[in-house]
């Protein structure tokens, strides 16, 4: 049975085996085409999601689709039902929490009262002044909290207590990429991890340990990538893996937060990277132990300079490293998180590409997660 499963796939009606290498090869080898069903699927960017959360205390903003203008949500008459609707619009299925926060002096958006219409938030037509003087601070999921705070040093061994959202993404029991738990069903990683193997069956996720081989594997239901653009092949390096069964959260298995839409990180902002990747360029083997390192945001202009990436780093990417080089992600770290800590930990980047590992002028290049929030929300909504 194990040998059969490893090398063959069972077609139905009539029952017969085909070689596993014929899965997701573009040909309908089973009469009903089921050999092409459980494959990496692409999902277009989709329409703008009409709600978003700001880094200003996670305050809720709502889009007026008629004008294209955004408004801050007033706390007046805001209910649990409205909170759930807002979170559902972003594709969350968990129970949200919300509270009132004072309208700050820097509030630059108009503040409006919110209502609901056919499961979408709307501005109340006859919206008067915001009597409470408060905005809605909304959290759709408890995320970004770990049991242990890492120390700020160069590269060191990491503990799963510090990074409970880190997972190993494996094909045929071999570590291929890192990834981050976003909620009980979803793991965030890089699209390029799946370019060699586009069948979903043999991919597994391992969560809850800092050692590569020591934790149980979780079955994957779907792998979804954003549309690939041959003109800009390094863009859109993002993927979502839907797990077959939801995770049970614990001290060592927890989600990381998505960034806020307006999370603009300035150069030299401290960030963290983690992974089981190669410890030296073209070198040896994967690390058995999870490693962590502190890096910082590197200015895109510097990153695109003639002695660096010469314009290849687009607005949907970001660079991180240390100016003198030597600390970087490498092969095997792909798909893992680039993390920023405010009140909680946020996954601001996905390990994507770079020339070499740790060079001073060619730092790591990361998919900028905030550029893909709309896509993530649309995928989640489609899968609710």
């Amino acid at each position: 049975k194990v040998i059969l499963d490893k090398y063959y796939f069972l077609c139905g009606q009539p029952l017969h085996f085909i070689p596993r290498k014929q899965l997701c090869d573009g040909e309908l080898d089973c009469p009903l085409g089921e050999d092409e069903e459980h494959c990496v699927k692409s999902f277009p960017e989709g329409p703008a999601v009409a709600v978003r959360l700001s880094k200003d205390r996670s305050t809720l903003q709502v889009l007026d689709s008629a004008t294209g203008n955004w408004f801050s949500a007033c706390f007046d008459n805001f209910t649990e039902a409205l909170a759930e609707t807002a979170c559902r619009q972003m594709g969350y299925s968990s129970k949200p929490t919300f509270r009132a926060v004072e309208i700050g002096p820097d509030q630059d958006l108009d503040v409006v009262e919110i209502t609901e219409n056919s499961q979408e938030l709307r501005m109340r037509n006859s919206s008067g002044p915001c009597l409470s003087g408060s905005l809605v601070s909304l959290h759709c999921l408890a995320c970004g909290k770990s049991l242990k705070t890492p120390r700020v040093v160069g590269v060191e061994e990491a503990s799963v207590d510090s990074w409970p959202w880190q997972v190993s993404i494996q094909y045929d029991k071999q570590h291929v990429c890192g990834g981050s738990i976003l909620d009980p069903h979803w793991v965030l990683t890089a699209a390029h991890c799946f370019r060699k193997h586009t069948d979903v069956f043999n991919w597994k996720v391992r969560a809850g340990s800092d050692k590569l081989g020591s934790f149980p594997s979780l079955a994957v239901a779907k792998i979804i990538i954003i549309e690939f653009n041959p003109m800009y092949p390094k863009d859109n390096d993002i993927a979502l893996m839907k797990l077959q069964f939801p995770l049970t959260f614990s001290g060592t298995v927890r989600p990381i937060c998505l960034p806020f839409f307006d999370e603009e990180l300035t150069p030299a902002t401290p960030l963290w990277i983690i992974g089981w990747g190669f410890t030296k360029q073209n070198g040896g083997k994967m690390s058995d132990i999870l490693l962590q390192a502190s890096v910082q945001v590197i200015d895109s202009t510097r990153c695109n300079a003639d002695d660096a990436y010469q314009g290849e780093v687009t607005e949907k990417m970001m660079c991180a490293g240390i100016p003198e080089g030597g600390v970087d992600t490498c092969q095997g770290d792909s798909g893992g998180p680039l993390m920023y800590q405010s009140d909680q930990w946020h996954v601001v980047g996905i390990v994507s590409w770079g020339y070499g590992c740790g060079g001073p002028s060619t730092p790591g290049v990361y998919t900028k997660v905030s550029a893909y929030l709309n896509w993530i929300y649309n995928v989640w909504k489609a899968e609710l």
Epitope: G26, E27, L28, G33, E36, C39, V40, K41, S42, P44, A191, H192, F194, R195, T198, I225, E227, F228, N229, P230, M231, Y232, P233
Partner: antibody
């Protein structure tokens, strides 16, 4: 089996437009990119552009921007390539070809080709 | 735009002999390179992708090698059906084809 069947030969006058169709069968149409490639008589292969049948998004070669349009009909698994403001140098065999995967890929299945002649 | 060049333009070989075709990219294309065979009046046929992986149904006498900017297609022992034009194609950024190498009978 996987097949791409193209429409028949066309003769057009300079300044006119031509629309070539490419019907896919034997695979999941929306899972694979479609490219268009042309070949002038006695010349090499020239890539014209791509289309993602899933989203309808396209990308065109620089030298054809503004003259080429690629569309699709998912109900019939057909991709169309329209070239406008035809000139004599557009005389060529036009091929549709399937991208081997959703990632960077070679073209593993080709249509039989459609001859387009532009002549006054 | 990435420019592809092929050499030689024409290669005259006897049946049973080895043929070596070269392809060069104007900048690194990693391993995102394919080789195609085209016979008169026919559509091109994919032989090699990823610089060295044979496409389904392609005989073992065809092999590809190289990465970065220099690539080679080798036909170990030419059969009569192998006389054709061979094109290399990069698909790292957008798509461009080389001008082709014609392999004819010596």
């Amino acid at each position: 089996q996987v097949q791409l069947v193209q429409s028949g030969a066309e003769v057009k006058k300079p300044g006119a437009s031509v629309k070539v169709s490419c019907k896919a069968s034997g695979y999941t149409f929306t899972n694979y990119y479609m490219h268009w490639v042309r070949q002038a008589p006695g010349q090499g292969l020239e890539w014209m552009g791509w289309m993602n049948p899933n989203s309808g998004n396209t990308g065109y070669a620089q030298n054809l921007q503004g003259r080429v349009t690629m569309t699709r009909d998912t109900s019939t698994s057909t991709v169309y390539m329209e070239l406008s403001s035809l000139r004599s140098e557009d005389t060529a065999v036009y091929y549709c070809a399937r991208g081997r995967t959703w990632f960077r890929s070679g073209m593993d299945v080709w249509g039989q080709g459609t001859t387009v002649t532009v002549s006054s | 735009e990435i420019v592809m060049t092929q050499s030689p333009a024409t290669l005259s070989v006897s049946p049973g002999e080895r043929a070596t075709l070269s392809c060069r990219a104007s900048q690194s294309v990693s391993s995102y390179l394919a080789w195609y065979q085209q016979k008169p009046g026919q559509a091109p046929r994919l032989l090699i992708y990823g610089a060295s992986t044979r496409a389904t149904g392609i005989p073992a006498r065809f092999s590809g090698s190289g990465s970065g900017t220099e690539f080679t297609l080798t036909i170990s022992s030419l059969q009569s059906e192998d006389f054709a034009v061979y094109y290399c194609q990069q698909y790292d950024i957008s798509v461009t084809f080389g001008p082709g190498t014609k392999v004819d009978i010596k």
